[in-house]
Interface confidence: medium
């Protein structure tokens, strides 16, 4: 496997008081293979609220690379292929659990972390505020 | 703490051969506060590809309950509020990490698992296959 420079301050994995710590097997089981999901590969281009994917990399995190969606337009694409600003493209956000090395560079010690990522975009009717 | 019936086959957390096992601090750190996220609260109703949330429960998994998006229509909602079948509502899927008790009923032994969840729906132009 990968050799990670070890931080001398790494916690003792046998320390019974290591806070709220459990043993986690990182041979990640992927439940998705049975369902044979059709990856939403080209939806980002075909959507009426298209998006671009941006790479976010952090070597101290697992997974190290996360792709983030950014909506291409404020409005949505209409039947003529033009942007209709009477509608809004908005990101669909989702929290994901990631593992962060803690302390940094410790090969066998992690903390679970929640981060918010934008997965894709959807087209919504705007909320119109009427001024009295 | 909680009294959990313990499986006698639980792995020894000090077993050096326990496969690819790491210590994980489950005090989940929330990185989302800095970005001040606005929850995409009502997008599921306001979207031109609206969706419902369905409950999926598994007591051996954390989080035990996952709410999955299911697109309400095959088509998308047009400006008149009707379903336009010339467009398609499709689910945006994302892999998330969950923890599974392994073996079951062991209080401090888990396996990371990747599952594919539908987060919401987007409206796409259909792929039309022309038959010669």
């Amino acid at each position: 496997g990968i050799t990670i420079p070890r931080n001398p301050g790494c916690p003792n994995s046998e320390d019974k008081n290591f806070p709220r710590t459990v043993m986690v097997n990182l041979n990640i089981h992927n439940r998705n293979t049975n369902t044979n999901p059709k990856r939403s590969s080209d939806y980002y281009n075909r959507s009426t609220s298209p998006w671009n994917l941006h790479r976010n990399e952090d070597p101290e995190r697992y997974p190290s690379v996360i792709w983030e969606a950014k909506c291409r337009h404020l409005g949505c694409i209409n039947a003529d292929g033009n942007v209709d600003y009477h509608m809004n493209s908005v990101p669909i956000q989702q929290e994901i659990l990631v593992l962060r090395r803690e302390p940094p560079h410790c090969p066998n010690s992690f903390r679970l972390e929640k981060i918010l990522v934008s997965v894709g975009c959807t087209c919504v009717t705007p909320i119109v505020h009427h001024v009295a | 703490g909680i009294t959990i019936p313990r499986n006698p086959g639980c792995p020894n957390s000090e077993d050096k051969n326990f496969p690819r096992t790491v210590m994980v601090n489950l005090n989940i750190h929330n990185r989302n506060t800095n970005t001040n996220p606005k929850r995409s609260s009502d997008y599921y109703n306001r979207s031109t590809s609206p969706w419902n949330l369905h409950r999926n429960e598994d007591p051996e998994r954390y989080p035990s309950v996952i709410w999955e998006a299911k697109c309400r229509h095959l088509g998308c909602i047009n400006a008149d509020g009707n379903v336009d079948y010339h467009m398609n509502s499709v689910p945006i899927q994302q892999e998330i990490l969950v923890l599974r008790r392994e073996p079951p009923h062991c209080p401090n032994s888990f396996r990371l698992e990747k599952i594919l969840v539908s987060v919401g729906c987007t409206c796409v132009t259909p792929i039309v296959h022309h038959v010669a």
Epitope: V22 | L26, K38, R39, S40, S41, P63, S64, I66, W67
Partner: antibody, heavy 126, light 107 residues
Framework: EVQLVQSGAEVKKPGESLKVSCKAS????????ISWVRQAPGQGLEWMGG????????DYAQKFQGRVTITADESTTTAYMELSGLTSDDTAVYYC???????????????????WGQGTTVTVSS | EIVLTQSPDFQSVAPKEKVTITCRAS??????LHWYQQKPDQSPKLLIK???HSVSGVPSRFSGSGSGTDFTLTINGLEAEDAGTYYC?????????FGQGTKVDIK
């Protein structure tokens, strides 16, 4: 829907201990946590602590640290709150509340209290 | 700890009128704010979760808005059964805290 039924009213003397139970029914016990919230007469709500049933974790408000113990028994789907060293300031209604652990609308774990017990009135008086 | 301050402390409102209760957090809490209703001699009841999400079984006249530090609970068209005390609650960090409560009575 989850229902939480608490033990009955108690009258205690200063210095004594209190143990309140909260029996859950109508849902998988492991899929949520139980928090304890108290309300002194005419006052607002005060969170004391809680337990995450899936992991067996407990969290306590610093004010009650060392004096409160929250436990749960999965086999009987019952949570308990024990408070020691009672004083007259502990006179209150004690509530248990369900805290779901869910991945909902794109977010991990919801920490709202979506179901409450009926409350247990505790009077501490010499 | 995060302090939640509600205003007003008390409100007397006529039926069918609009009620607005605000909750201010001492620091940014994103949208981790929930609203509860407590009627006299009853347990609290969840009304709105995560600032603006409606809860099953709660009348649509109850709505919530806001994020960051400023939040609002609105009752559009007060009904007699809405009399009680309303609390906000933050769940972004421990210890969980509640606002001091806003008592609403019917004129």
């Amino acid at each position: 829907e989850v229902q939480l039924v608490q033990s009955g009213a108690e009258v205690k003397k200063p210095g004594e201990s209190l143990k309140v139970s909260c029996k859950a029914s109508g849902g998988r016990f492991r899929t949520y946590g139980i928090s304890w919230v108290r309300q002194a007469p005419g006052q607002g709500l005060e969170w004391m602590g809680g337990i995450t049933n899936f992991f067996g974790w407990t969290d306590y408000a610093q004010k009650f640290q060392g004096r409160v113990t929250i436990t749960a028994d999965e086999s009987t789907t019952t949570a308990y709150m024990e408070l020691s060293g009672l004083t007259s300031d502990d006179t209150a209604v004690y509530y248990c509340a369900r805290e779901p652990n869910e991945f909902w609308n794109g977010y991990y774990t919801t920490h709202d209290f979506d179901s409450w017990g009926q409350g247990t009135t505790v009077t501490v008086s010499s | 700890e995060i302090v939640l301050t509600q205003s007003p402390d008390f409100q007397s409102v006529a039926p069918k009128e609009k009620v607005t209760i605000t909750c201010r957090a001492s620091q940014n809490i994103g949208s981790e704010l929930h609203w509860y209703q407590q009627k006299p001699d009853q347990s609290p009841k969840l009304l709105i979760k995560y600032a603006s999400h409606s809860v099953s079984g709660v009348p649509s006249r109850f709505s919530g808005s806001g994020s960051g530090t400023d939040f609002t609970l609105t009752i559009n068209g007060l009904e007699a059964e809405d009399a009680g005390t309303y609390y906000c609650h933050q769940s972004i960090s421990l210890p969980y805290t509640f606002g001091q409560g806003t008592k609403v009575d019917i004129k």
